[in-house]
């Protein structure tokens, strides 16, 4: 049987939520008029072909928007991008689509998202508010890589 994506809401430890602004995901403080995106996540169905003990390999999409998070090199550096893509199309591919995959690790209530295509690079938000989501190698410094997930519906 085919799985269905799980809708979740994500915020960081500073209670900032993800919002879509001009096709870019940014992290902003949760306020009355802020409408956070709902993230869809689904596990890769080829988990046996990926690294063990690194976390659960997942695809991350924006619920109802046909946009998925992916990692691609810009010059020498991996960058986080949004691409027009149906998350179920990625899920059903005959091989893992690594550029769109993240190892999801949970420790207590905290979650991290490590790029499968670029091991050691994690989804992060700058410690300052209102900044785009990025990929970083530097954990727990100027960037926050720990997020809280709340399952919806």
């Amino acid at each position: 049987k085919s799985e269905m994506p799980q809708p979740v809401s994500i915020q960081d430890i500073n209670h900032r939520v993800w919002v879509l602004q001009d096709q870019i995901l940014i992290a902003v403080p949760r306020k009355d008029r802020v409408s956070p995106v709902t993230i869809s996540l689904i596990s890769c169905r080829h988990v046996e072909t990926l690294e063990k003990d690194r976390g659960n390999p997942i695809y991350l999409g924006l619920n109802g928007l046909n946009l998925c998070l992916m990692c691609a090199k810009a010059g020498d550096q991996p960058t986080l991008q949004l691409k027009e893509k149906d998350i179920m199309d990625l899920y059903n591919q005959p091989e893992p689509v690594k550029s769109f995959l993240f190892y999801h690790s949970q420790s207590g209530r905290n979650s991290t998202f490590e790029s499968v295509a670029f091991p050691g690079w994690f989804i992060a938000v700058s410690s300052e508010g209102g900044c785009p989501l990025i990929l970083t190698q530097e954990l727990g410094k100027a960037n926050t890589t720990d997020f809280g997930l709340t399952m919806l519906f």
Epitope: L50, E51, N92, Q93, P94, E95, K98, S99
Partner: antibody, heavy 121, light 109 residues
Amino acid sequence: EVQLQQSGAELVKPGASVKLSCTASGFNIKDTYMYWVKQRPEQGLEWIGRIDPAIGTTRYDPKFQGKATLTADTSSNTAFLQLSSLTSEDTAVYYCARYDYSGSSFYFDYWGRGTTLTVSS
Amino acid sequence: QAVVTQESALTTSPGETVTLTCRSSTGAVTTSNYANWVQEKPDHLFTGLIGGTNNRAPGVPARFSGSLIGDKAALTITGAQTEDEAIYFCALWYSNHLVFGGGTKLTVL
């Protein structure tokens, strides 16, 4: 320019093993999947298996499980196919191919020119 | 294991449209089989044409298109050219393994 350079023809005795190589240039094998395919005269193509060179995980067609072993050396950008307990049935041309995701699908976009293996006493 | 069957040979003329098909022994071919089409020319020269049933590989001429026709995968060459004379293989995914067809020898004369 992307190229897959395969090792030269091999003549080996029944019961022996052989290791074929496929060296990539113009791209990093860590960024893709490397497939191996067998072609016997007048018998079409058979999928042997594939390796993800970045992490070394493999998949094999059940028919080649135990016969073929796929490995990769990312430092030399080379994928390898080892065949063991050779018989005349293993006489064939063996191809490596890149199976890559681009835009919306996976494709066999580049192929080596094949290595001819002859098993004979 | 599934068997994938193709026409053994087809002949067409330059400028004509020709369709090659790919049948599965397990039933109808669907998008879940992610049909691939590969061209073989003399001297072991292989080129990937189509992936995921209907997606042309980068750099492949627009005259090549992939589709599902009835219960089979199909490769259509619209306006065949003499350089399209080759053997064409389809490959279908079944869960975690790939099965190739026996190939269709296409003659363009």
